[in-house]
Amino acid sequence: SEVEYRAEVGQNAYLPCFYTPAAPGNLVPVCWGKGACPVFECGNVVLRTDERDVNYWTSRYWLNGDFRKGDVSLTIENVTLADSGIYCCRIQIPGIMNDEKFNLKLVIKPAKVTPAPTRQRDFTAAFPRMLTTRGHGPAETQTLGSLPDINLTQISTLANELRDSRLANDLRDSGATIRIG
């Protein structure tokens, strides 16, 4: 079953996906597609990296994390209700049937009329069930999925949006990444 992430109309959605390169800059190709991961490749590709760089993307889809260190989390800018659905992050590990496939469900909610809360940077030892963070760009508030449910199949940490928080290191160290090599 896919992990669920939420965002409001007009905000930026964040879909986390990580791997650990064998060496810095020694990249594994990754594709992001709209729709569940098929047997091979990604359907309806919106972004792709190769062994060197980000080599394909379409408007509104970009990487906000350090992809050369394995943070290939997808940002979707200014989402609409039509952006709801399943997204596939596929880490294309060399070899037959070695790919790691992750299906992430994006749920878009209508925009709230009330003003958004201010940036939250104080985290308690016990994770809240839902966490709202604000990123670098305009209107970049994301509501991220259920933190206690993180496991190896999710490759889901918050290191991108929380790169200036100790929580980012704690989550990445918890093992919720795929290690290559």
Partner: antibody
């Protein structure tokens, strides 16, 4: 082929306003950010900042906050740099340069030909 | 801001020479280092990205190396058309600062 074509040279007086254009062709305008780079006479390159061509959100380097404004005319695939209340030290060549939108992809693969701005009383 | 320091400021070479241009960052930038060439009265041109990755259309005599805070641009066999100023750029942290440049001259 991909091209960034900038407007022509400008001669302005201190206190005036200038607006420099950069028209893109050969690619989908909203899939890349547009950066602006200043080069004073005989000096090196200094990044002023960049603008997200999809959202229109600008990001300014600290030295270029206040009198400087980036803007877009997406329908014309054009980006603009406006400098208000011109000073003599604004005399320079200004380049637009294409930047991928990704946070950690910050090389500039295509550049405009540059617009020379001279500020003199 | 990360300060990028290039050396030497000026380099006079003979065609056919192999030359090395140095760039040092004030803090580690991993391999987020890009090199540009600017000929007189022209726009800069991207030569190398991510410290060592070649760019389509750039002659193979240009190569880059380094990681962390020390980087080198090498020109295997200098040609007369290589004259110009070479800039390194920090691609890791905004405002993505450039070095002061190395001017390459032909003797």
């Amino acid at each position: 082929q991909i091209q960034l074509v900038q407007s022509g040279p400008e001669l302005k007086k201190p206190g005036e306003t200038v607006k420099i254009s950069c028209k893109a062709s050969g690619y989908t305008f909203t899939t890349y950010g547009m950066s602006w780079v200043k080069q004073a006479p005989g000096k090196g390159l200094k990044l002023m900042g960049w603008i997200n061509t999809y959202s229109g959100a600008p990001t300014y380097a600290d030295d270029f906050k206040g009198r400087f404004a980036f803007s877009l005319e997406t329908s014309a695939s054009a980006a603009y740099l406006q400098i208000n209340n011109l000073k003599n030290e604004d005399t320079a060549t200004y380049f637009c340069a294409r930047k991928p939108p990704h946070y950690y992809v910050n090389s500039f693969d295509y550049w405009g030909q540059g617009t020379t701005l001279t500020v003199s009383s | 801001d990360i300060v990028m320091t290039q050396s030497p400021a000026t380099l006079s070479v003979t065609p056919g020479d192999r030359v090395s241009l140095s760039c040092r960052a004030s803090q580690s930038i991993s391999d987020y280092l890009h090199w540009y060439q600017q000929k007189s009265h022209e726009s800069p041109r991207l030569l190398i990205k991510y410290a060592s990755q070649s760019i389509s259309g750039i002659p193979s005599r240009f190569s880059g190396s380094g990681s962390g805070s020390d980087f080198t641009l090498s020109i295997n066999s200098v040609e007369p058309e290589d004259v110009g100023v070479y800039y390194c750029q920090n691609g890791h942290s905004f405002p993505y600062t450039f070095g002061g440049g190395t001017k390459l001259e032909i003797k």
